[in-house]
């Protein structure tokens, strides 16, 4: 359905007030340096011109595409060059190759402050005083340091941050009633940006096919009552949602999203019984709560899958007429049979199946070949069930804080190239996958641990890949999508690292450390683990343990001296000392 | 399970001194920060020196810096308390300790293994 002017369309169909969010989340994610007073102009300028061309969609310019439109605008930045450098070159490029080129400049880890959180009462006064700056403000400083948010979810963050304001800033105890939502709204907008990173991943550098893939395994599994067709139209729209979001077509994306919702709502009986309550809800609420929900039950008396898969006489047939199809349907019946497997696992057995087939069907006795391609998934099912139970049993033991140790230590052994912040992060992320995961049965201790580990991982993928040093991360990123977890987990201690040199600045550490938080307090003690570990991998567990409570001794005296820089200057220089001794630094 | 046993304490006069041990059985030995606390009657158990893993670095109460001097040998699983200038405040039943897995360096509940303790009594 062509319409003359896309512009003109989009903003009938979003309104006013979510066009102008998601253009500017569109420009903060583009132009992640630009300060918040330049997007605004921006922004009210595109808006202008849509409202021109809502009242005549023939006026100059209004049949131009949206990329030309928002890119001609981004290009007008005077400081283009000063503060992006090579990135002002994509201004010399026509549509399409100009937003590619846009698209390929978005920073994973912007070189940008962190946010600090102003006093409860100043935030409040913000609010009062100008409530739409306030929130826009918010959606411009989360989407110019996560260029990738799911733009339309960011639109229902925004409003539970505007609904929490309104609420807590004329509650007797705002700090009491305020903090803990910010907090919640901060983890999951942590979170929803790391999964929203792996599928523009996914989608990126695997393409379409390992994304419908994907889509096709998790909604099965959350849909197992729908019939095929069912599903394969919801991956194919789906597809289309995330294609457009990923690739800055965020107005698009956004509207595409809502009809994607409204078809779900309508044709709830033949998708889930979990929906009832998701579709009486108001648009951005209803989209959430529809990306959430629980598993549907599973049809009883489900029929065996070797039946069609392995025993009937037409599977080379059925497999050379419509090979994806086929597939598909392997990965929907098995999906929607396991929903205590993870989505990867799922994805590694139709691997198998489709290479045994490609085998099988070329060979003399087909049935004969492929007869026993069950037997193979045993040993990749087992894999990530044993793994998941050893760390559960590691995590239950040690707790998270000394968990996300552990897997520093780990980490650090396999690829200790790494920048310290990314193995900081990275770790402490794959150590919460204990409090996340492991309080469940067993039936969804590994959906939820592998395939959030593959979120860490893809955040280290991506992170590395802005700064590539080492093959070995490469390897595991790029090789395959699904078996990345399996190839970090199978990687040992990298016997080629030359141990960093030591300096004593690196383990240098002053008073302001007594004042941070719990958290900010662990991370720098990770870090001082970390470049342990880099200075000597050769150290035990045992002795990295034993240095580490040395630290926390340090720590902990220091912090409770009169003179704590002092302190910490003199048995600092005497803690590196001793440390030296014992472990040759 | 970890067995500690103190010896070394006995009667003395101020400003003599006493050096006590404190052997070790069981887990490993060396992985693991010692420490000294003491409870005089009447009083709370009391931190007194913290000896690392490896004993190239000690941590002690003001009340005793610069007249103990805490040390181990790996080798020999023992860890000792060397004690100078002793004075009457001293008197006290000493415990040695093993560090634990968490908690603070400066407090009993941070140690896992406690010996039964040995009686140091300061006249003057």
């Known amino acids: 359905d062509a319409h003359k002017s896309e512009v003109a369309h989009r903003f009938k169909d979003l309104g006013e007030e979510n066009f102008k969010a998601l253009v500017l989340i569109a420009f903060a994610q583009y132009l992640q340096q630009c300060p918040f007073e330049d997007h605004v102009k921006l922004v009210n300028e595109v808006t202008e011109f849509a409202k021109t061309c809502v009242a005549d969609e023939s006026a100059e310019n209004c049949d131009k595409s949206l990329h030309t439109l928002f890119g001609d605008k981004l290009c007008t930045v005077a400081t283009l060059r000063e503060t992006y450098g090579e990135m002002a070159d994509c201004c010399a490029k026509q549509e399409p190759e100009r937003n590619e080129c846009f698209l390929q400049h978005k920073d994973d880890n912007p070189n940008l402050p962190r946010l600090v959180r102003p006093e409860v009462d100043v935030m409040c006064t913000a609010f009062h005083d100008n409530e739409e700056t306030f929130l826009k403000k918010y959606l411009y400083e989360i989407a110019r340091r996560h260029p990738y948010f799911y733009a339309p979810e960011l639109l229902f963050f925004a409003k539970r941050y505007k609904a929490a304001f309104t609420e807590c800033c004329q509650a007797a105890d705002k700090a009491a009633c305020l903090l803990p939502k910010l907090d919640e709204l901060r983890d999951e907008g942590k979170a929803s940006s790391a999964k929203q990173r792996l599928k523009c991943a996914s989608l990126q550098k695997f393409g379409e096919r390992a994304f419908k893939a994907w889509a096709v395994a998790r909604l099965s599994q959350r849909f197992p009552k729908a019939e095929f067709a069912e599903v394969s139209k919801l991956v194919t729209d789906l597809t289309k949602v995330h294609t457009e979001c990923c690739h800055g077509d965020l107005l698009e994306c956004a509207d595409d999203r809502a009809d994607l919702a409204k078809y779900i709502c309508e044709n709830q009986d033949s998708i889930s019984s979990k929906l009832k309550e998701c579709c009486e809800k108001p648009l951005l609420e209803k989209s959430h709560c529809i990306a959430e929900v629980e598993n549907d039950e599973m049809p009883a008396d489900l029929p065996s899958l070797a039946a069609d898969f392995v025993e009937s006489k037409d599977v080379c047939k059925n497999y050379a007429e419509a090979k994806d199809v086929f597939l598909g349907m392997f990965l929907y019946e098995y999906a929607r049979r396991h929903p205590d497997y993870s989505v990867v696992l799922l994805l590694r057995l139709a691997k198998t199946y489709e290479t045994t087939l490609e085998k099988c069907c070329a060979a003399a006795d087909p049935h004969e070949c492929y007869a026993k391609v069950f037997d193979e998934f045993k040993p990749l099912v087992e894999e990530p069930q044993n793994l998941i139970k050893q760390n559960c049993e590691l995590f239950e033991q040690l707790g998270e804080y000394k968990f996300q140790n552990a897997l520093l230590v780990r980490y650090t052994k396999k690829v200790p190239q790494v920048s310290t912040p990314t193995l900081v992060e990275v770790s402490r992320n794959l150590g919460k996958v204990g409090s996340k995961c492991c309080k469940h049965p067993e039936a969804k201790r590994m959906p939820c641990a592998e395939d959030y580990l593959s979120v860490v991982l893809n955040q280290l993928c991506v992170l590395h890949e802005k700064t590539p040093v080492s093959d070995r991360v490469t390897k595991c990123c790029t090789e395959s999508l699904v078996n990345r977890r399996p190839c970090f987990s199978a990687l040992e201690v990298d016997e080629t690292y030359v141990p960093k040199e030591f300096n004593a600045e690196t383990f240098t550490f002053h008073a302001d450390i007594c004042t941070l938080s719990e958290k900010e307090r662990q991370i720098k003690k990770q870090t001082a683990l970390v470049e342990l570990v880099k200075h000597k991998p050769k150290a035990t567990k045992e002795q990295l343990k034993a240095v580490m409570d040395d630290f926390a001794a340090f720590v902990e005296k220091c912090c409770k001296a009169d003179d704590k820089e002092t302190c910490f200057a003199e048995e600092g220089k005497k803690l590196v000392a001793a440390s030296q001794a014992a472990l040759g630094l | 399970q970890v067995q500690l046993v103190e010896s070394g304490g006995g009667l003395v006069q101020a400003g003599d001194s006493l050096r006590l041990s404190c052997a070790a059985s069981g887990r490993t030995f060396s992985g693991y920060a010692m420490g000294w606390f003491r409870q005089a009657p009447g009083k709370e158990l009391e931190f007194v020196a913290r000896?690392?893993?490896?004993?190239?670095?000690?941590y002690y109460a003001d009340s005793v810096k610069g007249r103990f001097t805490g040390s181990r040998d790996n080798a020999k699983n023992t860890v000792y308390l060397q004690m100078n200038s002793l004075k009457p405040e001293d008197t006290a039943v000493y415990y040695c300790a093993q560090r634990g897995d968490s908690g603070s360096n400066y407090d009993p509940s941070g140690y896992s293994y406690w010996g039964q303790g040995t009686q140091v009594t300061v006249s003057s």
């Open positions: 000896i690392n893993w490896s004993g190239t670095l000690t």
